[in-house]
């Protein structure tokens, strides 16, 4: 008898895919040109990309630190008008991507949460998320917390809302804080909540260290579901050098989890490279035209137009990972077990039930490697073969779906591996 | 032909204000970034912000050193841009250029002298 | 933030002489994207404004003369004055605009012996 399939886990919208953060319209659409009517027309662009959900805004009308002059039931009319945003909706839904509107209410001042009428803001928020709600969003997205006093119970509060709405709706929460206890502290006491942090960010340096990050948070998080990213709004070029971007991207699509990228991660937008864009939201680099600012700073191979048209490019690994990720069983819910590969790499297999399974090779240092595989690190349901096919690496080169011997394994510096095995009784 | 005069210098006491101003003319004011430098006397250069063009939402970004303390600003019908000195320090004392564009700094003022001292 | 080096602070040379003035930073300029240098050069007289010599390290701007080269990569720049003419005294500043802030190095005082 063939052993009895094991119950595949209910899936909600947001764990079968990526979301990609769009803070601020003008920056990504072009400056002059950012409002609700110019984002319709780049949800194609979206659905190229495989996300879920688009993390939205702030759009409300926010005067500078004045919570009297801050309406978060209304457009921001630079942004475009409540008919704009509904046509919008409309438009994702078609395209089966999901809208999350982020409600951080002072975004334009100093305190997103304004220092001293804490109360006045939590009921202007949940008022807010009944108006959205009704008005057919999926989601929303609240940053800085860790600025709102007694979070906690603020955020039970607007998830019982999100959820009383409809299960299928998703509230995230976004934090500066990089600390582990900090971050789990928000965690207990709401269930579903999503939460991007910093608590990656600081791990470029090493594969043993980003193998203890990553095992930590998965062990002190236990079963519930997580997002990955490298911070709750910025570019992760703010983070990475250049030569890590490819790395990250794999680890962040592989990871057990929803990763959430920002506008620009899938060509690796570098503001530091664009002189006089700010840090935090730099143009979106379209074509060449896109910053006219400084001439000679942008070549071809820096735009979406100049990266969709060569396949070895950042926005091509995107597309292929973030495809793979919303399709394949094991990358979609599976089991995660992390193992030892020798110093500076990490890596780990993704497995479900009698699917194909994943392995990830991740060598963060600036040396070749080779892969030294602790097998017996594993769980027996997740034994190793003795050879892999190359389903994509982050370098350029190796001849996809050939198999590798796991055992003679090498991986350049810089390299990320991503093979594939099938299951084995 | 781009004309930078900066004026509004002068002395003032530690803990007090000043604003400096920048009259330009010869080009599109609203099309282009402006920026304040400053010199103390004998030393090197200093980068101390800018403000954004027109298409970039007239947005600041300003060096560590004045940021909370100092104020880019502009008057685009006039096409005269400000610096706004508060809390001055002794070690504030400086010339202060006014140059066009955010980075590569093609063009500048003549430089206006504030002086910080009790 | 990145610092920016300029070496020597000084230097005494002849009228006709090549001269070479050097600038360091502490993380490199060089971005992979458009193999492009952040770096430009600055020329200050005496009593005057700065003035603007080269841009991306190594691109001269319209009117000045030739004999001004920049080059250099990564971490390493250098800014060469071929057959000093007396009106190249001067200060020269090296600035960087790869990220904030847009530091200026300490500057190079040519002479003229």
């Known amino acids: 008898r063939a052993p009895r399939c094991r119950e595949l886990p209910a899936q909600k919208w947001w764990h079968t895919g990526a979301l990609y953060r769009i803070g601020d319209l003008q920056a990504f659409q072009g400056h002059g040109a950012g409002n609700l009517a110019g984002l319709k027309g780049r949800l194609d662009y979206l659905s190229s990309l495989k996300v879920k959900g688009l993390v939205l805004g702030p759009i409300h009308k926010n005067q500078k630190d004045d919570v009297a002059q801050t309406d978060l039931l209304q457009i921001d009319p630079n942004f475009g008008s409540k008919e704009d945003f509904d046509s919008l909706l409309q438009s994702a839904k078609k395209k089966s991507i999901r809208v999350i509107l982020d409600l951080t209410p002072n975004y334009r001042g100093e305190n997103s949460w304004f220092s001293t009428q804490v109360d006045t803001v939590a009921t202007k928020v949940k008022d807010a998320l009944e108006f959205w709600l009704q008005a057919g969003v999926d989601g929303f997205q609240v940053r800085d917390i860790e600025n709102l006093k007694d979070a906690s119970s603020f955020l039970a509060e607007w998830q019982n809302i999100t959820k009383g709405f409809s299960e299928d709706r998703l509230l995230i929460a976004g934090t500066n804080s990089s600390d582990l206890q900090q971050i789990l502290s928000l965690l207990e006491s709401n269930k579903d909540l999503l939460l991007t942090s910093s608590y990656l960010s600081d791990s470029g340096s090493t594969g043993e260290h980003t193998k203890s990050l990553v095992t930590q948070y998965l062990n002190a998080t236990g079963n519930r579901w997580c997002s990955w990213s490298l911070s709750q709004a910025r570019l992760l070029t703010s983070f990475l050098p250049a030569q890590l971007l490819r790395l990250y991207q794999l680890m962040l699509f592989t990871l057990p989890g929803t990763p959430v990228f920002s506008y620009g991660d899938e060509i690796g937008l570098d503001a530091a490279a664009l002189p006089g864009q700010p840090m935090e939201a730099p143009v979106m680099l379209w074509d060449e035209s896109s910053f006219p600012d400084i001439p000679g700073a942008v070549s071809a191979n820096m735009t979406v137009k100049g990266q969709s048209e060569d396949p070895g490019s950042l926005l091509s690994l995107f597309r292929r990972l973030s495809d793979q990720r919303s399709k394949e069983r094991s990358l979609l819910h599976g089991d995660f077990h992390a193992f030892s590969a020798g110093p500076g790499l990490f890596s780990y297999i993704r497995h479900w039930d009698q699917n194909e399974r994943f392995l990830v090779v991740l060598n963060f240092g600036d040396v070749g490697l080779s892969a030294g595989l602790q097998a017996s690190d594993l769980p027996a349901s997740a034994s190793l073969p003795a050879k892999a096919d190359l389903l994509l690496s982050t370098q350029p080169g190796r001849e996809e779906g050939s198999p590798l011997e796991l055992e003679r394994l090498k991986l350049e510096p810089h390299e990320g591996l991503l093979l594939r095995f099938p299951y084995a009784a | 032909e781009v004309k930078l005069v900066e004026s509004g210098g002068g002395l003032v006491q530690p803990g007090g204000s000043l604003r400096l101003s920048c009259v330009t003319s010869g080009f599109t004011f609203t099309d282009y970034y402006m920026t304040w430098v400053r010199q103390p006397p004998g030393k090197a250069l200093e980068w101390l912000g800018f403000?954004?063009?027109?298409?970039?939402?007239?947005?600041?970004e300003y060096s560590a050193s004045v940021k909370g303390r100092f104020t880019i600003s502009r008057d685009n019908s006039q096409s005269i841009l400000y610096l706004q000195m508060n809390t001055l320090r002794t070690d504030d004392s400086a010339t202060y250029y006014c140059a066009r564009d955010p980075a590569t700094l093609a063009y500048w003022g003549q430089g206006t002298l504030v002086t910080v001292s009790a | 933030d990145i610092v920016m080096s300029q070496s020597p602070s000084s230097l005494a040379v002849s009228v006709g002489e090549n001269v070479t003035l050097t600038c360091k930073s502490s993380q490199s300029l060089l971005y992979s994207g458009n193999q492009k240098n952040y770096l430009a050069w600055y020329q200050q007289k005496s009593g005057q404004s700065p003035k603007l010599l080269i841009y991306?390290?190594?691109t001269r701007e319209s009117g000045v003369p030739d004999r001004f080269t920049g080059s250099g990569s990564g971490t390493d720049f250098t800014l060469t004055i071929s057959s000093v003419k007396a009106e190249d005294l001067a200060v020269y500043y090296c600035?960087?605009?790869?990220?904030?802030?847009?530091?200026f190095g300490g500057g190079t005082k040519l002479e003229i012996k």
């Open positions: 403000i954004r063009n027109k298409a970039n939402g007239y947005t600041t």
């Open positions: 991306w390290a190594s």
């Open positions: 600035q960087k605009y790869y990220g904030y802030p847009y530091t």
